[in-house]
């Protein structure tokens, strides 16, 4: 979900934005801080064993509108929140995993012995 207003084409920020990064720190980050022309994000998703994993970092302006839209992906429990209102704003983002749907149990991969 986008935290500060929807727009079709993201307008370039006049200045760099610093974000907290965790599990998603690019090479040019320093002390778990990355910089971007786009958005800060925090994401929660299930790993292969069904445990929730929280990731945070920077999204470049290019394509970030789509990534921040949080379109549901079949068979994948994941939620992302984005922000731009201040540096390290993603420290205060707390996305939650979408609830399990009954279909998620039925439609899972079938393992044959």
């Amino acid at each position: 979900k986008k935290e500060d207003g929807e727009s079709t084409a993201p307008t370039p920020r006049p200045k760099v934005l610093r974000c907290k990064c965790h599990h998603h720190c690019p090479e040019d980050s320093v002390n778990n801080i990355c910089s971007t022309d786009g958005y800060c994000f925090t994401m929660i998703e299930e790993d292969d064993s069904g445990l929730p994993v929280v990731t945070s970092g920077c999204l470049g302006l290019e394509g970030s509108d789509f990534q921040c839209r949080d379109t549901p992906i079949p068979h994948q429990r994941r939620s992302i929140e984005c922000c731009t209102e201040r540096n390290e704003c993603n420290k205060d983002l707390h996305p939650t995993l979408p609830p399990l749907k009954n279909r998620d149990f039925v439609d899972g991969p079938i393992h044959h012995r």
């Epitope: 990355c34 910089s35 022309d37 290019e62 201040r86």
Partner: antibody
Framework: QVQLQQPGADLVKPGTSVKLSCKAS????????MQWVKQRPGQGLEWIGE????????MYNQKFKGKATLTVDTSSSTAYMQLSSLTSEDSAVYYC?????????WGQGTTLTVSS | DVVMTQTPLSLPVSLGDQASISCRSS???????????LHWYLQKAGQSPKLLIY???NRFSGVPDRFSGSGSGTDFTLKISRVEAEDLGVYFC?????????FGSGTKLEIK
Amino acid sequence: QVQLQQPGADLVKPGTSVKLSCKASGYTFTSYWMQWVKQRPGQGLEWIGEIDPSDTYTMYNQKFKGKATLTVDTSSSTAYMQLSSLTSEDSAVYYCARFGYYVDYWGQGTTLTVSS
Amino acid sequence: DVVMTQTPLSLPVSLGDQASISCRSSQSLVHSTGNTYLHWYLQKAGQSPKLLIYKVSNRFSGVPDRFSGSGSGTDFTLKISRVEAEDLGVYFCSQSTHVPFTFGSGTKLEIK
């Protein structure tokens, strides 16, 4: 037009502190970072750090942590850099500079002389 | 810290000549966003630096088209096609990809 006004010079004693100022005009002060850069003769330019006036978020060059403290007064569109425990090594020209993704405008610089 | 190595340190030219300054960085300046934050400044005697070129090859407003920038990754060049008297001074390259931001040691453009 964008202007960054700095006092021309300051003379201070070793062991003391000094607060350098940089008054911005001609643009929205909170829309850009303000950086500070040190220049000593024959030693090139050194990045001290930067402050985002919109939320007072700072980033420092590790080398200047504990030496420099960056602040802003948004009501007067002025950025400040305090330098503490001054020695002759701190004698230099100090520039403030407007930064978005690169520095596009510089102040005229303040020549700081540390001498007893 | 990223080390910016500029060559030559001094560049004697005749007015009307072409001048070329090289800047090499100790690591790639391609940012995770895809941008390359390498910039060029000119500092004339007794003045503050002035921006010439930003993000490798973009001329800043009011900068004559005889100035051009090129390069990628770790290797960058500033060219002045026909040197004029007002171009004399010290040229610095600078990177704002990696914190702390760093500068080249400068190239002094002077009359032969």
